[in-house]
């Protein structure tokens, strides 16, 4: 686990002609905020695809009003970092989308209006624990300057935040098979191993040796469904292992609901729907007035000024029952994707995903990479039913086991010479050409076809392609 951090340094007009109009005006003051979306691997997915690694939204920046006649300056920015926590390993290669949003603060009906001002995207390699990386991206006439890094949250360490460090138990050395944790030499690696036999489907651990159960499962290894332990199922006592399958009396037999309440069976017991003026598990409580506060979950009580007159609860959205005591079955809308099991926990919906899927709504397909490893620091990228390895620089092949020659494909255009380099390749361009791949002709007057050469690079200089 760890955190990706993004620091926005400036957002304003880029160099060159055609400065953009200020997004705010005296009539329509506005303020900026930013959204970052991260995806693992070097995916070129649509902007709308899920932010599988996470997303974050900045605070709103200061209110800005354009000064009439003045050019658009760098716009005032929100304070602080954008932080995207990630629960699992840091993938090393990632795609990002950074959006600049404008919040207009005029007198709109229905509150402020939001509009997307600029969107930049890129693909990068980044090791967790490294220094801040600086970047400049252009979107139309706008320019965004920012820095980013990924850092591990203790006890995780390493370039992927997959190694765990614990304080040493003995002062001199780590246990068998465990190495010291660089740079924390006074700590030792601790592999995260759940308790032996812990159910991989229904159990998980956050500390080595533990086995914590997902909702609906119990037992030391999370292998026992909750319903079989107490067996209040509609159909009588449990057979040895398969749950409540033996036919028996239903829980509504003989109608346990008093005072005219109607009984309905539930998976584990029964439920009474009570007439007005009565509540309780079996509609046994009566003589209630609004002064007794009979409406639950924020329901509004009307009438019922004395015990002889019935009260009515007007329930807020999402609740029902004569006392607003029942939550509407939100799972019936089937929000979980890919066959996930929906659980309504009251404060939130949870999806228990089938093997091979993950995410809050089981929207991420992990199947293609399950049990497959990419060698030499490669990252597995799923898609289309077949796994693919995004290989570290210098390696190639299906599983990144082959040494790659970055110059083999002759990437340098117009007679440029290619040199293999530890971080990729370098093109030394022939006279008259420039660019990372020597793809841009230099015009006779010295201007290039590029919108702007990167700072510090002259036409004809070797350029490293990252």
């Amino acid at each position: 686990a760890g955190v990706f951090e993004l620091q926005i340094h400036s957002f304003g007009p880029g160099p060159g002609p055609g400065a953009p109009r200020s997004p705010c005006s005296a009539r329509l003051p506005c303020r900026l905020f930013f959204r970052v979306c991260l995806k693992p691997g070097l995916s070129e997915e649509a902007a709308e695809s899920p932010c599988a690694l996470g997303a974050a939204l900045s605070a709103r920046g200061p209110v800005y009003t354009e000064q009439p006649g003045a050019p658009a300056p760098d716009l005032p920015l929100p304070d602080g970092l954008l932080q995207v926590p990630f629960r699992d390993a840091w993938p090393g290669t990632f795609s990002f989308i950074i959006e600049t949003w404008r919040e207009e603060l005029g007198d709109q009906i229905g509150g402020p209006a939001w509009s997307l001002l600029a969107r930049v995207a890129g693909r990068r390699r980044l090791a967790a624990g490294g220094p801040w990386a600086r970047d400049i991206q252009r979107a139309g006439a706008w320019e965004l300057r920012f820095s980013y890094r990924a850092r591990c949250e203790p006890p995780a360490v390493g370039t992927a935040c997959t190694r765990l460090c614990r304080p040493r138990s003995a002062p001199s050395r780590c246990g068998p098979g465990l190495r010291p944790c660089a740079p924390l030499e006074d700590e030792c690696e601790a592999p995260l191993v759940c308790r032996a036999g812990c159910s991989p489907e229904h159990g998980f651990c956050e500390q080595p040796g533990e086995c914590r159960c997902l909702e609906g499962w119990t037992g030391p290894l999370c292998t026992v469904p909750v319903s079989t332990s107490s067996c209040l199922s509609p159909r009588g006592p449990s057979s040895a292992t398969t749950g409540c399958l033996v036919p028996g009396p239903g829980p509504c037999d003989g109608n346990p609901c008093a005072n005219g309440g109607s009984c309905s069976e539930t998976p584990r017991s029964f439920e009474c729907t009570c007439p007005r003026g009565f509540y309780g598990l079996r509609c046994e409580v009566s003589g209630v007035t609004c002064a007794d506060g009979p409406c639950f979950n924020g329901g509004l009580c009307v009438g019922g000024a004395d015990p002889d007159s019935a009260y009515i609860c007007h329930c807020p959205p999402g609740f029902q029952g004569s006392n607003c005591e029942k939550r509407v079955d939100r799972c019936s809308l089937q929000p979980c994707r890919n066959g996930g099991l929906c659980l309504d926990l009251g404060h939130a919906l949870r999806c228990r995903c089938r093997a091979g899927f993950a995410g809050p709504r089981c929207e991420h397909d992990l199947d293609d990479c399950a049990g497959r490893a990419c060698a030499n620091g490669g990252t597995c990228v799923e898609g289309g039913g077949a796994h693919r390895c995004s290989c570290a620089l210098g390696f190639g092949g299906r599983d990144c086991r082959e040494r790659a020659d970055p110059c083999a494909a002759r990437p340098c255009a117009h007679g440029g010479r290619c040199y293999a380099h530890f971080s990729g390749l370098v093109c030394a361009c022939a006279p008259g050409y420039m660019g990372a791949r020597c793809e841009f002709p230099v015009h006779p007057d010295g201007a290039s076809a590029l919108p702007a050469a990167p700072p510090g690079l002259r036409p004809g200089d070797p350029q490293r392609y990252l």
């Epitope: 932010c51 974050a56 959205p317 939100r330 809308l333 929000p335 994707r337 809050p360 709504r361």
Partner: nanobody, 120 residues
Framework: EVQLVESGGGEVQPGGSLRLSCAAS????????MGWYRQAPGKQRELVAG???????IYAESVKGRFTISRDNAKNTVYLQMSSLRAEDTAVYYC??????????????WGQGTLVTVKP
């Protein structure tokens, strides 16, 4: 904050038609699932029709063949075309949506409801 605003309710005779609309607005990144529930007096709220998280359409048995759900993704709006209406369709119809916010969290939202009355 996210708002769901329903419209199109009213009184209609048996066999008549109505079209309900529900527009979602606010700080929405994407809509995962969206649909219509209804609650008749003294009854539990039940799902009428919806688009699931997997974008399938689902209908309650009692409305199949009579009601049609559709949507306009660009407007974050869902519609319920109700025809061959019966007295038992009388209820408050609520729009519901499972929404992904910009924070990447999902939240479930309800509209305030629109009343549909079917009577001769």
């Amino acid at each position: 904050e996210v708002q769901l605003v329903e419209s199109g309710g009213g009184e209609v005779q048996p066999g008549g038609s109505l079209r309900l609309s529900c527009a979602a607005s606010g700080f929405i990144f994407s809509i995962n699932a969206m649909g219509w529930y209804r609650q008749a007096p003294g009854k539990q709220r039940e799902l009428v029709a919806g688009f699931t998280g997997d974008t399938n359409t689902i209908y309650a048995e009692s409305v199949k063949g009579r009601f049609t759900i559709s949507r306009d993704n660009a407007k974050n709006t869902v519609y319920l075309q109700m025809s061959s209406l019966r007295a038992e369709d009388t209820a408050v119809y609520y729009c519901a949506a499972d929404v992904q916010l910009f924070s990447r969290d999902y939240e479930f939202y309800w509209g305030q409801g629109t009343l549909v009355t079917v009577k001769p």
